[in-house]
């Protein structure tokens, strides 16, 4: 039994919960922006349901989303990025629920990449570096990064460090010797834009040196 009504009878549809959330990604493909929306309830029957955005667009009044499995997606250059747009869930011509959203307040950055850790023996530290595509962007350039690391055996004991640069130094004495560590990083808009954390970068794994027994230092 579908959760929406067919044959023009929309009464059942209006009983369902069509709450949804969206995020934007600016300049995600050259000068193209994207907008992704999905229902909060994964059990919503999405057959015949469409998403539409109207307002704060360039040259057009409204745009329809493409459906990709359970998400709805637009990639376009036509977002004005000034003011509020109206995003609606529709069945046919009828709007079931709508949200007014400024697309610059729901920005989800792209995940950082090329995460690596280099051990400096002389300095007794580890230099963590990573890259972000946002350094080259016109709009969302300023990000806060969250570097998380843990000893591999401590499943939920993550240590987090927030930073605005793409380089972090971890002191050797703060880490356990002869241990395997996992490290990862994500980003969030920090200035001029608002939104959500990116996906995590792929994890990087590194091993700390053993302790040198004579000096009490790690090898």
């Amino acid at each position: 039994e579908s959760g929406y009504a067919q044959n023009g009878d929309l009464e059942d549809a209006e009983l369902d919960d069509y709450s949804f959330s969206c995020y934007s990604q600016l300049e995600v493909n050259g000068s193209q922006h994207s907008l992704t929306c999905a229902f909060e309830d994964p059990d919503v029957n999405t057959t015949n349901l469409e998403f539409e955005i109207c307002g704060a667009l360039v040259e057009v009044k409204c745009l329809n989303f493409r459906k990709l499995q359970e998400i709805y997606f637009i990639e376009t250059k036509k977002f004005l990025l000034i003011g509020k747009s109206n995003i609606c869930v529709k069945v046919g011509e009828k709007s079931l629920t709508c949200k007014k959203i400024d697309l610059t307040t729901i920005v989800k950055p792209e995940a950082p990449f090329d995460l690596s850790v280099i051990y400096r023996e002389g300095a007794n530290d580890f230099v963590v570096t990573f890259n972000t595509s946002h350094l080259q962007k016109k709009y969302v350039k300023v990000l806060m990064h969250d570097v998380a690391y843990r000893q591999e055996k401590d499943e939920n004991k993550w240590t987090h460090v927030n930073l605005s640069s793409t380089k972090l130094t971890l002191l050797q004495r703060k880490l356990q010797p002869a241990a395997m560590y996992e490290i990862k990083v994500r980003s969030i808009p920090d200035h001029y834009f608002k939104g959500f954390w990116s996906e995590w970068s792929p994890s990087y794994y590194f091993r700390t040196p053993e302790i040198n027994n004579s000096s009490g230092e790690m090898d």
Partner: nanobody, 118 residues
Framework: EVQLVESGGGLVQAGGSLRLSCESS????????MGWFRQAPGKEREFLAA????????HYSDSVQGRFTISRDNAKNTVYLQMNSLKSEDTGRYYC???????????WGQGTQVTVSS
Amino acid sequence: EVQLVESGGGLVQAGGSLRLSCESSGSTFSSDAMGWFRQAPGKEREFLAAIGWSGAVTHYSDSVQGRFTISRDNAKNTVYLQMNSLKSEDTGRYYCAEDYDTDVWQYWGQGTQVTVSS
């Protein structure tokens, strides 16, 4: 109710500059888009420039691109329009607007007169 008060208009010679200000009484100013428009005598009101809530995104009409600059100070609830290389056709009443919501500006000021003499 949001009130917008424009200032900075006046008489200026062609080629000169003016800086218009628009102060908002609105408590949501720092999250609202702002825009500038003008109405020349006997003509319809035309869009000039708009700026997003943070100032990061701006948009200009072709007629003022490169000559006018829109900016904002959220601490002062004020939006500005810096107008350079003014021409006689820039003469008109200049209005600011607040809260661009689904292609409609929700609030308007009373305007300030700009006259460019040649």
